[in-house]
Amino acid sequence: TMAIWRSNSGSNTLENGYFLSRNKENHSQPTQSSLEDSVTPTKAVKTTGVLSSPCPPNWIIYEKSCYLFSMSLNSWDGSKRQCWQLGSNLLKIDSSNELGFIVKQVSSQPDNSFWIGLSRPQTEVPWLWEDGSTFSSNLFQIRTTATQENPSPNCVWIHVSVIYDQLCSVPSYSICEKKFSM
């Protein structure tokens, strides 16, 4: 069974702590080396107006998931719990198409970084998605921010088109994902 959400909300940049968009085709291009180049255009629709959708109001639909770009600052763990409270999980990137979609969304917020659902206990242990699945670097590389002062960046965020490791305690925005089945 599929939940159908009906929404009459407008399309603001920031509403109730969430970054909203109606359609992402008009984003400025990222200035850094982009992950978008080999990716097909997105098919994103935000649940606005009176329509039937498998996603709650203000979530963005792309393929078989709903996405919420939270604009409240939180640690990685706090962001994870925030997503859970909304019946979702921190973003898990499954394909290059999905990666391209996400890059296109966050590129409109070049000053902000967004936690995704990738972490590890320490540097000797491999990265793990929140659902327990393995991380494959074939999909994307994680650029390290490790320094002598901060040697243990064990959580992952995306900034424009680059994915970085980062200290899990640093407050940041986040991306929640809710998968649905048609």
Epitope: D77, P121, Q122, E124, V125, P126, L128, E130, D131, G132, S133, T134, S136
Partner: antibody, heavy 118, light 107 residues
Amino acid sequence: QVQLVQSGAEVKKPGASVKVSCKSSGYTFTDYYIHWVRQAPGQGLEWMGWINPNSGDTNYAQKFQGRITMTRDTSISTAYLELSRLRSDDTAVFYCARNSGSYSFGYWGQGTLVTVSS
Amino acid sequence: DIQMTQSPSSVSASVGDRVTITCRASQGISSWLAWYQQKPGKAPKLLIYGASSLQSGVPSRFSGSGSGTDFTLTISSLQPEDFATYYCQQAYSFPFTFGPGTKVDIE
């Protein structure tokens, strides 16, 4: 639903090898680590290592280095544990388990009893 | 290797009792800790992961707390099916290690 089904009980002599299989179903086999855990009679749980079914990469507990081999056959969604140079104190139930969140073991096989006796 | 200790090693309790089991790591493991329940002749069952997250399908009378080196599993109101052995497990560093177990039996 996720299921892990292991091969049947084995009786081996000291010095021999044993190979236990673990067939997965109900999920994408290559997406999750498979761990192997053993439990001697009346004792606690002991992690032996894992295999990444996608890459074949393994990580073994130091205690078993040199006589443990974990492999997989992705075409039949099956992981294998081979333990060589068996000793009587290797008598145990061997479990495979699928990785879950925070490196926990969310799904377990039914266990395979391996008895090492002369 | 990180050593995990549990206390008590066994506890006798009655249906309806609140039962608390503690687990201590020999070094800090953040929240990389899981709890399992095992009944005789059966495989372990995951109850809690990430120190406090309840595994899907596990009754809400089970809860986990703690971070760093000290962790707690609480059964708020013991049910007949809860008599079993409980293990904690750290997933902070290799090799992953388990506590020795706490047996909960009928008083």
